[in-house]
Interface confidence: low
């Protein structure tokens, strides 16, 4: 019988709240001292009279206040994230598609387009998407290269998304960019084909714009027998989403609560 | 007497390892089903015979393998991070210093230099530094601006560090850039003055290079009575470091273990 | 850190991550998960012997804090610290699915 | 989430974050911390009533997992989830120091 065994692990006995508070307070006494590596509170004999110096208060406030661009402590996992995510992938539209024609000539950029009907098949509603990654297989790279990722915005305009500093490498390596927000936008809009641009980083005073990095799916003059591998390893979107039926189940159980 | 109370909270009874394993296994049974929102295992009646399709295996492997640029789960806090950090700040060298003279004319950039002797006073050894932030007070901004931060590298070369997309704002706002690695480098080197550059982001095909954002410490024509506030709010490095004596204590206790 | 590197190679009696491999077929009687065949779930076990008493010398307690009660809890408990996800492949009807389950593998434990 | 917004305004008996304000002078008898005068340390308390038995219907258990045993522990425990740091100002001799103490304020709890 498991019942007796159960008691060995049970901690749900009646607990005296005041005792717990007292223990917590005493634990904090030790915690603060131990974090400061002090065996006992520091002597206050030499502390100058009067208020704290302005500079010290300013420093204390800088430390206390969170500012734009500073990352907060990790957020608790939202309820929806507890449940499993279905994983799918959508390959980039192949480069012989006519959409690429007007972008072919650039030395500083490569373009990657995706069919939104395939995306919608994988993720019927934007709210279901929990993560989307753009994955690219970079081939050998002789020199360090700083690249930037852009999203196609309207007509011929591009919106900056992120950047990456690529170290030289003798072997192929997968790169991943988080594009969750962008893919969520695409799922909400009516467009048929949407895309990204990977560009060399150009600083304001430098004119060296050539994209040196070789991304699988774009290189030419390959041996025919490599074509299949090459095609399967072209850029793709890796999608993680809550399946529709689970999402509905999740909503109805949330309503029942 | 506290002793009796103590027993209410104690959980350090002898525990049957096999029972715990059995409970954990049964808990996992429920956990997997609940994460998949299944009340019972799915029927296998319609599963096609033979191995899994190649595409499914490829997708499974993509999910299983971690790739460059994908963030891992948060790392456990290293032992050294458990202990308190001393917080100090080092203000930027004032703009009337001669170091700025050769950089004054640029429309796309502003420059910020720091005295490394002040940094070394705050953090005597590079290994003690746990975090360094460059903090800038941005004033009102009428249009969205994409800015980049660079580190002065050698002679007249600059190394890209990070970027930020600044939204328009009617009120001043502190910006923070994590520059821990850079400051650690500076502490290891012999230079007297080191610096950063904040520049407008220039894409390869656009030539709009003007830095629109106004950073406190660089604007001119201020009323005299604002000078002090303005001076104190000029860019600074906020440093968090293990005090030298605590670090030594930490090392000796690590050796004793 | 109370992680697999330390705990699996030591005889630590206090809070530590303990080895546990789950074979879906053998341990759970499941044939429906096609990949993987099983996984290293692991679990946390062991007391967090936090010394608490009004008359204990603090100098003795301080060194134990980081390991045994870093969160200054009234009754510290041995729980997972670092967790990793698990992708699985299974069928719904004739359709294969790849799904990722979050926080399935215990990599390290802590007294919290 | 078992956070301050939910727990401080409810009468939840199970695992939840509980209010605890520490006044350094009154509660610890300390005058040496000059800023702040105290802080909301809070703490986690309450059972994690995970139903475990070979004959329990799984359909009944599933709904309880997320709240009461998301980590599939053999004996889930109520512990901090989100923590925040605390900066303090104190003197060493004549010299004021600002230091940041990590993981001092409990913002939410979880059964782990």
């Amino acid at each position: 019988d498991y019942k007796d065994d159960d008691d060995k692990l049970s901690t749900s006995k009646t607990i005296d709240m005041e005792l717990v508070k007292r223990k917590r307070i005493e634990a904090i006494r030790g915690q603060i001292l131990s974090k400061l590596r002090l065996a006992s509170p520091p002597s206050q004999g030499e502390v100058p009279p009067g208020p704290l110096p302005e500079a010290v208060l300013a420093l204390y406030n800088s430390t206390r206040d969170r500012v734009a661009g500073e990352s907060a402590e990790p957020e608790p996992e939202p309820e929806a994230d507890y449940y499993a995510k279905e994983v799918t992938r959508v390959l980039m539209v192949e480069t012989h598609n006519e959409i690429y024609d007007k972008f072919k000539q650039s030395t500083h950029s490569i373009y990657m387009f995706f069919n939104t009907s395939e995306l919608r098949e994988a993720v019927p509603e934007p709210v279901l998407l929990s993560r989307a990654e753009l994955r690219l297989l970079r081939l050998k790279l002789k020199v360090e290269q700083h690249v930037e990722l852009y999203q196609k915005y309207s007509n011929n305009s591009w919106r900056y998304l992120s950047n990456r500093l690529l170290a030289p490498s003798d072997s192929p390596e997968w790169l991943s960019f988080d594009v969750t927000g962008v893919v969520r936008q695409w799922l909400s809009r009516g467009g048929e084909i949407e895309g990204f641009r990977l560009s060399a980083h150009c600083s304001c005073d430098s004119r060296d714009n050539t994209l040196q990095v070789d991304i699988n799916g774009f290189t030419t003059g390959r041996r025919g027998d490599l074509a299949t591998i090459h095609g399967m390893n072209r850029p793709f979107l890796l999608l993680m989403a809550t399946p529709l039926e689970r999402a509905q189940h999740l909503q109805s159980s949330r309503h029942r609560r | 007497d506290y002793k009796d109370d103590d027993d209410k909270l104690s959980t350090s009874k002898t525990i049957d390892m096999e029972l715990v394993k059995r409970k954990r296994i049964e808990a996992i049974r429920g956990q997997i089903l609940s994460k998949l929102r299944l009340a019972s295992p799915p029927s296998q009646g319609e599963v096609p015979p033979g191995p899994l399709p190649e595409a499914v295996l490829a997708l499974y492997n993509s999910t299983r393998d971690r790739v460059a640029g994908e963030s891992a789960e948060p790392e456990p806090e290293p032992e050294a991070d458990y202990y308190a950090k001393e917080v100090t700040r080092v203000l930027m060298v004032e703009t009337h210093n001669e170091i700025y003279d050769k950089f004054k004319q640029s429309t796309h950039s502003i420059y910020m230099f720091f005295n490394t002797s002040e940094l070394r006073e705050a953090v005597p050894e590079p290994v003690l530094l746990s975090r360094a932030e460059l903090r800038l007070l941005r004033l009102k901004l009428k249009v969205e601006q994409h800015v980049e931060l660079y580190q002065k590298y050698s002679n007249n070369s600059w190394r890209y560090l990070s970027n930020r997309l600044l939204a328009p704002s009617d009120s001043p706002e502190w910006l923070s850039f994590d520059v821990t690695g850079v400051v650690r480098q500076w502490l290891s080197r012999g230079g007297e003055i080191e610096g950063f550059r904040l520049s407008a982001h220039c894409s390869c095909d656009s030539r709009d290079n003007t830095l629109q954002v106004d950073i406190n410490g660089f604007t001119t024509g201020r009323r005299g009575d604002l000078a002090t506030i303005h001076g104190m709010n000029r860019p600074f490095l906020l440093l968090m470091a293990t005090p030298l004596e605590r670090a030594q204590h930490l090392q000796s206790s690590r050796h004793r273990r | 850190a109370l992680d697999t590197n330390y705990c699996f190679s030591s005889t630590e009696k206090n809070c530590c991550v303990r080895q546990l491999y789950i074979d879906f077929r053998k341990d759970l009687g499941w044939k429906w998960i096609h990949e993987p065949k099983g996984y290293h779930a692991n679990f946390c076990l062991g007391p967090c012997p936090y010394i608490w008493s009004l008359d204990t010398q603090y100098s003795k307690v301080l060194a134990l804090y980081n390991q045994h009660n870093p969160g200054a809890s009234a009754a510290p408990c041995c729980v997972p610290q670092a967790l990793e996800p698990l992708p699985i492949v299974y069928y719904v009807g004739r359709k294969p699915k790849v799904e990722q389950l979050s926080n399935m593998i215990v990599r390290s434990c802590k007294c919290s | 989430a078992l956070d301050t917004n939910y727990c401080f305004s409810s009468t939840e008996k199970n695992c939840c974050v509980r209010q605890l304000y520490i006044d350094f002078r009154k509660d610890l008898g300390w005058k040496w911390i000059h800023e702040p005068k105290g802080y909301h340390a809070n703490f986690c308390l309450g059972p994690c009533p995970y139903i475990w038995s070979l004959d329990t219907q799984y359909s009944k258990v599933l709904a309880l997992y997320n709240q009461h045993n998301p980590g599939a522990s053999a004996a889930p425990c109520c512990v901090p989830q989100a923590l925040e740091p605390l900066p303090i100002v104190y003197y060493v001799g004549r010299k004021p120091k600002v230091e940041q103490l990590s993981n001092m304020i409990v913002r939410s709890c979880k059964c782990s």
């Epitope: 206390r64 | 009617d170 009120s171 | - | 301050t4 401080f8 304000y21 006044d23 009154k26 702040p36 005068k37 105290g38 909301h40």
Partner: antibody, heavy 122, light 108 residues
């Protein structure tokens, strides 16, 4: 059960003084920041001031000369001393518990008493 | 002191209507802004703090937005129990606590 009960209101002549009390129960009073707010008949809310756990007070500019806030933690009681009263001080006076979950924002009124009416009239 | 200017001072609406009340601060207060509801003969009740955080137990039809100087309280679908007076409040520090003059929501 958190409770705040104001008392000490009533009719008072112009130029005289009055002391209002606010009795707190159901929570750890000495750990909480407390506020006084008033509301003239048919008008909006006016913040008078606040007292922190340590006894530090903040008051609105208009209240600084004549109004004093104090507390007695041993009695779980908050006080508002009003001097040189005028007809325009006629109002319902509320005490309210501060909400200090974010560090320094003690001025969100999380829990209010029912109020006590002060009428200044000759 | 910071002045909080609320508009409109009163409005008439029907059950089911979407109602919006705005509040303007005389200087930037970041998101240190709260909204209260008051019914006749009762003390005010906290609805929203930090400009957009819903107080526990407040129905989700209430929402708040804004930062800096401009703030909005929205009731997505007015219910019979929502007819009351609403006040905004700034609380960025002890020298800038102030209430708006109130907005009375009446039955049309």
């Amino acid at each position: 059960q958190v409770q705040l009960v104001e008392s000490g209101g009533g009719v008072v002549q112009p130029g005289r003084s009055l002391r209002l009390s606010c009795a707190a129960s159901g929570f750890h009073f000495s750990n909480e920041a407390m506020n006084w707010i008033r509301q003239p008949p048919g008008k909006g809310l006016e913040w008078i001031g606040y007292i922190y756990t340590s006894g530090t007070t903040y008051r609105s500019n208009w209240a600084r000369g004549r109004f004093t806030i104090s507390r007695d933690n041993s009695k779980n009681t908050l006080y508002l001393q009003m001097n040189s009263l005028r007809a325009e001080d006629t109002a319902v006076y509320y005490c309210a518990r501060g909400w200090h979950i974010f560090g320094h924002q003690y001025w969100v009124m999380h829990f209010w008493g029912q109020g006590t009416l002060v009428t200044v009239s000759s | 002191d910071i002045q909080m200017t609320q508009s409109p001072s009163s409005l008439s609406a029907s059950v089911g209507d979407r109602v919006t009340i705005t509040c303007q601060a005389s200087q930037s207060i970041s998101t240190y802004e709260a909204w209260y509801q008051q019914k006749p003969g009762q003390p005010p009740k906290l609805l929203i703090y930090a400009a957009s955080t819903l107080e526990s137990g407040v129905p989700s039809r209430f929402s708040g937005s804004g930062s800096g100087t401009d703030f909005t309280l929205t009731i997505s679908s007015l219910q019979p129990e929502d007819f009351a007076t609403y006040y905004c409040q700034s609380y960025s520090d002890g020298d800038s606590v102030g209430f708006g003059q109130g907005t009375k929501v009446e039955i049309k």
